[in-house]
């Protein structure tokens, strides 16, 4: 413990105390504040200034202050969080959500509750990526595009364009080519087979899938349909 090295003084009538000083109502004097990392151990009197002391472990003060006790640091970060700022005598611990998660319930500093980012399912791609404070939004893959993954980052990708279509693509599956040179690179003479994927996803009942190849249809679940003509709001 040490005293701050100057004596309290009475302010001029109608005047204010200087920077890093406060007016003590009991002593009716301008007294020193304690610096960040310390707190007021003994308040000032008419003849002695504030006595400051260091914050104890797991407590802190971030500002110049005259609080009798330092503030407690927040509890340890939960398993879905990472500590981005440690608890020191001058700053509180800050917990932020770990990668793949976002803050569903924030607090003054850091996050109170993290939630896992939504993953878009086959047939849907990311329309709006997740941020520190907002979840992923998914959208149906438009005709001519697909997504065959469950992912919080994958967008809908164009179907490969085939010279000869073996199986037309749909919202959750790429087109399958029999030609030797589809528009996306692959080994000469190979038949491109998309990754196997469950066709179950948020789709309408099976109807002919949209295809880049004219005159072909293939019964598989496909993306949702726009409203009937005449609906408002477009």
């Amino acid at each position: 413990p040490r005293a701050v090295a100057f004596t309290p003084y009475a302010p001029e009538p109608g005047g204010t105390c200087r920077l890093r000083e406060y007016y003590d109502q009991t002593a009716q004097m301008c007294c020193s504040k304690c610096p960040p990392g310390q707190h007021a151990k003994v308040f000032c009197t008419k003849t002695s200034d504030t006595v400051c002391d260091s914050c104890e472990d797991s407590t802190y003060t971030q500002l110049w202050n005259w609080v009798p006790e330092c503030l407690s640091c927040g509890s340890r970060c939960s398993s879905d969080q990472v500590e981005t700022q440690a608890c020191t005598r001058e700053q509180n611990r800050i917990c932020t959500c770990r990668p793949g998660w976002y803050c569903a319930l924030s607090k003054q500093e850091g996050c109170r509750l993290c939630a896992q980012l939504r993953k878009c399912r086959p047939g849907f791609g990311v329309a709006r990526p997740g941020t520190e404070t907002s979840d992923v939004v998914c959208k149906p893959c438009a005709p001519g595009t697909f997504s065959n993954t469950t992912s919080s980052t994958d967008i809908c990708r164009p179907h490969q364009i085939c010279h000869v279509v073996a199986i037309p693509g749909n919202a959750s599956m790429d087109a399958v080519c029999t030609s030797t040179s589809p528009t996306r690179s692959m080994a000469p003479g190979a038949v491109h087979l998309p990754q196997p994927v469950s066709t179950r996803s948020q789709h309408t009942q099976p109807t002919p899938a949209p295809s880049t190849a004219p005159g072909t249809s293939f019964l598989l679940p496909v993306g949702p349909s726009p409203p009937a003509e005449g609906s408002t709001g477009d």
Partner: antibody, heavy 125, light 107 residues
């Protein structure tokens, strides 16, 4: 806080059209992250999803196959509401009808998080 | 359509009891399952999403588990305000479907 306020008649004659409206406050019918659903509940069928409308750069509709030939769900952006029309009703369509907001269409974490107060619709002559 | 079968259809338990409801899907629905609570004259209320995630503000005595086709909903210590009907709901595929409900009463 999202709130859904339902309106519409409680009595409809057989073969006529059931029409209900759900007014949205605290969110937008054109929201790029929500979907707007109609669900009904009756003692015989329990909770039955009827369909939804949602906007992702364009409007989408999905309908239950059981009512697909008779149902229309339309967004009304100017009034921030959406409507249900069910044609050619029969007494079997008697139920409490709910509108509900769905968060997470097409992804994991897809659920109904806000519901209207429910409207009992009786189909009877 | 994917059928969701809940059991039991009704049950009676005492305050403080551990209560378990099961929900079986007619085909694999992965983890795409939610649980709702409905009190008389009210709309359903989301309790748990994606099998086991508690909605914000829902008491921790509610929990869920399972995957594939078999799922369980548990109230660890029944409270008087838990008297309601509970529904499971799948969103693996359209149409979205609900279980027939489990009515919970106090003994």
């Amino acid at each position: 806080q999202v709130q859904l306020q339902q309106s519409g008649p409680g009595l409809v004659k057989p073969s006529q059209t059931l029409s209900l409206t759900c007014a949205i406050s605290g969110d937008s019918v054109s929201s790029n992250s929500a979907a707007w659903n109609w669900i009904r509940q009756s003692p015989s069928r329990g909770l039955e999803w009827l369909g939804r409308t949602y906007y992702r750069s364009k409007w989408y509709n999905d309908y239950a196959l059981s009512v697909k030939s008779r149902i229309t769900i339309n967004p009304e952006t100017s009034k921030n509401q959406f409507s249900l029309q069910l044609n050619s009703v029969t007494p079997e369509d008697t139920a409490v009808y709910y509108c509900a907001r769905e968060d997470g269409v097409g992804g994991t974490k897809d659920y109904f998080d806000y519901w209207g107060q429910g409207t009992l619709v009786t189909v009877s002559s | 359509d994917i059928q969701m079968t809940q059991s039991p259809s009704s049950l009676s338990a005492s305050v403080g009891d551990r209560v378990t409801i099961t929900c079986q899907a007619s085909q694999d629905i992965d983890n795409y399952l939610n649980w709702y609570q409905q009190k008389p004259g009210k709309a359903p209320k989301l309790l748990i999403y994606d099998v086991s995630n508690l909605e914000i503000g829902v008491p921790s005595r509610f929990s869920g588990s399972g995957s594939g086709t078999d799922f369980t909903f548990t109230i660890s210590s029944l409270q008087p305000e838990d008297i309601a009907t509970y529904y499971c709901q799948q969103y693996d595929n359209l149409p979205l479907t609900f279980g027939q409900g489990t009515r919970l009463e106090i003994k």
